[in-house]
């Protein structure tokens, strides 16, 4: 089956959610791990990741269609220390499949705002830190 990984971001007030979404077949969930790395150009692994999610096969989901699993990493307040390059990755211990999402970046600006760039088209996000609004 076709397995792919996408990265996205959303804001709720001052919180920034970084989301790694893996699309896979139901039976492929077992043994799959999704993880998010920062500033790891070559050695992004579950061990060096900021957060990881081990997928489990959900017997409650009927059919053999494609399903999605999400890892969400929430930053309560973005600070200059969060500036850097992030990447969503996944791997299967069963099949040996390795997935690497596109690199995306958080840039904290001198005005106290931050931008998230490198996401899918129409997902260049610019956030005003103090007001907590999407501009």
């Amino acid at each position: 089956g076709c397995i792919n990984i996408t990265s996205s971001a959303s804001q709720e007030g001052t919180r920034l959610n970084l989301i790694c979404t893996v699309w896979h077949k139901k039976e492929e969930a077992e043994g799959f791990v999704v993880f998010l790395c920062k500033d790891r150009s070559g050695d992004c692994s579950p061990e060096t990741s900021l957060k990881q999610l081990r997928l489990k096969r959900d017997p409650g989901i009927d059919g053999v269609g494609e399903i999605s699993s999400q890892l969400m990493f929430t930053i309560s307040q973005v600070t200059p220390l969060h500036s850097g390059t992030y990447q969503c990755c996944a791997r299967s211990q069963k099949s040996g499949i390795r997935l690497q999402g596109h690199f995306f970046s958080i840039l904290f600006t001198e005005t106290g705002n931050y931008t998230v760039t490198g996401l899918k088209q129409r997902q260049h996000l610019e956030f005003s830190h103090n007001e907590g609004t999407l501009s």
Epitope: G13, D39, I75, Q77, P80, L81, H82, G132
Partner: antibody, heavy 119, light 107 residues
Framework: EVQLVESGGGLVQPGRSLKLSCAAS????????MAWVRQAPTKGLEWVAS????????YYRDSVKGRFTISRDNSKNTQYLQMDSLRSEDTATYYC????????????WGQGASVTVSS | EIVLTQSPTTTAASPGERVTITCRAS?????MHWYQQKPGASPKPWIY???KLASGVPDRFSGSGSGTSYSLTINNMEAEDAATYYC??????????FGAGTKLEIK
């Protein structure tokens, strides 16, 4: 178990230098931004400096800018604070602390290193 | 720079008493964190993001507030709660600031 162990403190004359070290263990050091927080005798806490996980970005409180330098060696799981042109008001216990990645709280602290600046 | 003012500076409470420590910010902040420090020991994160208890903190503690006014409350004071409590916030560009601390003693 997360452990942060500071060393390098001591008595130093005004205008002199001192370098503090903080040896970290029990977590993936290279993933975390680190900080130094100080506490003058019988006083409150004061943030001194922070460094990004990769070491490329550093931040300081105004009173130490140009005098103190924070750095780290991820291969040695150690962060440092080089303190130059020390003043009597820098006398304090200096704590090494980790930045929680998802929040702005300092979640792990070392036992502290005592620095006394006096002639 | 945002200034955090804690009150009272010192207070004493009897076992079983309800205690409230307040932290006022000179400008609005998004979250407040609280630390507990006992003599000769390092500070410990106690309450983070205004109301979340750190691991191992008894549920007699609670935190609340918004804007410029935040508080830490102990519902039934116990001897082991005697310590100094500090509030802390993050804001750009002043970065990390702490309150001067509230010393809580047991009667």
């Amino acid at each position: 178990e997360v452990q942060l162990v500071e060393s390098g403190g001591g008595l130093v004359q005004p205008g002199r230098s001192l370098k503090l070290s903080c040896a970290a263990s029990g977590f993936t050091f290279s993933n975390y931004a680190m900080a130094w927080v100080r506490q003058a005798p019988t006083k409150g806490l004061e943030w001194v400096a922070s460094i990004s996980s990769g070491g490329g970005d550093t931040y300081y409180r105004d009173s130490v800018k140009g005098r103190f330098t924070i750095s780290r060696d991820n291969s040695k799981n150690t962060q440092y604070l080089q303190m130059d042109s020390l003043r009597s008001e820098d006398t304090a216990t200096y704590y090494c602390a980790t930045h929680n990645y998802e929040s702005t709280v300092f979640d792990y602290w070392g036992q502290g290193a005592s620095v006394t600046v006096s002639s | 720079e945002i200034v955090l003012t804690q009150s009272p500076t010192t207070t004493a409470a009897s076992p079983g008493e309800r205690v409230t420590i307040t932290c006022r910010a000179s400008s609005s902040v998004s979250y407040m964190h609280w630390y507990q420090q006992k003599p000769g020991a390092s500070p410990k994160p106690w309450i983070y993001e205004t109301s979340k208890l750190a691991s191992g903190v008894p549920d007699r503690f609670s935190g609340s507030g918004s804007g410029t006014s935040y508080s830490l409350t102990i519902n039934n004071m116990e001897a082991e709660d005697a310590a100094t409590y500090y509030c802390q916030q993050w804001n750009y560009p002043s970065m990390y600031t702490f309150g001067a601390g509230t010393k809580l003693e047991i009667k």
